[in-house]
Amino acid sequence: IWELKKDVYVVELDWYPDAPGEMVVLTCDTPEEDGITWTLDQSSEVLGSGKTLTIQVKEFGDAGQYTCHKGGEVLSHSLLLLHKKEDGIWSTDILKDQKEPKNKTFLRCEAKNYSGRFTCWWLTTISTDLTFSVKSSRGSSDPQGVTCGAATLSAERVRGDNKEYEYSVECQEDSACPAAEESLPIEVMVDAVHKLKYENYTSSFFIRDIIKPDPPKNLQLKPLKNSRQVEVSWEYPDTWSTPHSYFSLTFCVQVQGKSKREKKDRVFTDKTSATVICRKNASISVRAQDRYYSSSWSEWASVPCS
Amino acid sequence: RNLPVATPDPGMFPCLHHSQNLLRAVSNMLQKARQTLEFYPCTSEEIDHEDITKDKTSTVEACLPLELTKNESCLNSRETSFITNGSCLASRKTSFMMALCLSSIYEDLKMYQVEFKTMNAKLLMDPKRQIFLDQNMLAVIDELMQALNFNSETVPQKSSLEEPDFYKTKIKLCILLHAFRIRAVTIDRVMSYLNAS
């Protein structure tokens, strides 16, 4: 058993049918010695008397808010949560496996630049009685500071019969140098509590590996005289790290016909312009990627050919 | 990216071309190592990230773009020597390009070259003959060093008398390639910045 926060405790259970469970001793936080009784949740049934209460915690029915009283007055509370270990592996019931970029990916994180700011998100089908708390650091043995905000519900989607809820959090490394070469990964730890179930999820990454630039901005077309060709131009996104000559991007320019089946013409360039043939009803799209470290491509910025 | 690429002209700055070749070569070598050594811990998540140049060179600090010198987090160990030389520098480009930066890059390359050559000698003794260092990568390191044209004492190749542990050598190769790739990215960024200055 360990303390998650004041008066909230997590009991770790080896979870299998007929498991013996864990013996837990609760102590009433009071100078009083006599006349103390214990109850669980809203029930008025007295579970025991005395300054300490010993319970065998086996199932969720044994978890909840234990309260010690004296003469009708509440002295203190202890909330017991359960953390299930199933065959040596901690349970992952609360969050959905996003399966991207690989199986067992519960937390996904992205950064728009090298400033040390990043966003993580996760999915669940649970709509109520759910709380998250997020901590982060650079490295784990001698952790350096990363400050995270509160997790918020960022999207709701309908997936078949189920509703899916997306939560996200923004974090900022306290003293980040965009040019630094990372040798210790960022660690992100999410505590999830659903009713009386506790779970924790972690992700470890280097900012360089989660970079995904915003799409190029100000995408414009300039027709070339007496030609089907156009000059496409664009700019670096505002959110990208500066100076751009140091934090350079490379670009992919795509000409896509109206039909998805039509052949796509693609050109790669390090410049912020390109000359392409603009077909009728086609659209031109441009996306960006770090020129020197191949992390994710940005989403496409698009303009119609007409 | 085996599709049409519009490549910029390296122009006045010969080192840019060499540094791009270096990054390509080390990335290819790392990919080859990951595939060949699939049963070894060779991915970025599995290895310890060690920097053999730590406390010996200060490339990131010495080559920091001027725009980032206002960022206190980038200045923890910044040295401020602005003397310029080295053949990559056109004499009129002196604002950011300090000798310290380019000589630091040269020292990095020299240290990695020695490590890679020592390692290759060990790998050649492996009866499995599983992996060797790409000669192209070693050649590209050499070319960039020559383009930088710094005179420095030659470091003797380390020789080891004890029987090599090939498992450890292959893991060390992965560690070295990951670190060298990160340094090659920094070098490329620096050269691109210098080229634009």
Epitope: D14, W15, Y16, P17, D18, A19, E59, F60, K85, E86, D87, G88, I89, D93, K102, N103, K104, T125 | F39, P41, E46
Partner: antibody
Framework: QVQLVQSGGGVVQPGRSLRLSCAAS????????MHWVRQAPGKGLEWVAF????????YYADSVKGRFTISRDNSKNTLYLQMKSLRAEDTAVYYC????????WGQGTMVTVSS | SYVLTQPPSVSGTPGQRVTISCSGG????????VKWYQQLPGTAPKLLIY???QRPSGVPDRFSGSKSGTSASLAITGVQAEDEADYYC????????????FGTGTKVTVLG
Amino acid sequence: QVQLVQSGGGVVQPGRSLRLSCAASGFTFSSYGMHWVRQAPGKGLEWVAFIRYDGSNKYYADSVKGRFTISRDNSKNTLYLQMKSLRAEDTAVYYCKTHGSHDNWGQGTMVTVSS
Amino acid sequence: SYVLTQPPSVSGTPGQRVTISCSGGRSNIGSNPVKWYQQLPGTAPKLLIYGNDQRPSGVPDRFSGSKSGTSASLAITGVQAEDEADYYCQSYDRGTHPALLFGTGTKVTVLG
């Protein structure tokens, strides 16, 4: 004590269907994940499928994906395996089993796919 | 499709020490717990070892399990005639958990 009693096995022709049941008693069935494991005659153990305690997630071996469906009725304390488009290579003893460090197995039920 | 490899058979005389190996990789045994089962002819498998080296109550202490790196092993010290059976190791793969990964199985024969 924990008990898993299996039923539903038998002889079936290729291409036909069969449903296996596993009745649980002696524990809170709705709190635990459950597996199906099979063993072809003279061969080793092969995992078939898994279902979460609440039925929210199901996992299948590639060899049965799209043909077999694992399900559970927590009100009846029963686990099921619906097998469709049966093949000769599905011939095996099928076991249900609880998920956890200490597990309990059913007695096994024989499924023979033969024309 | 078996990823965990066991020797097909091992044998020993009563009283001898018999060991069975189970070889896997970094994504299964290397990062997940290992179990061992004993299966007597015509019966369901019986759990002998869980969590690499833990013995459930009721399992004789001549059975012991261990794990090192990407391999695990089961030792029977002082093998007895009633130990003649098939033995299977089991683990998970970190990418496909909770799918069970079973070893190829080992037939233990007690001679004499």
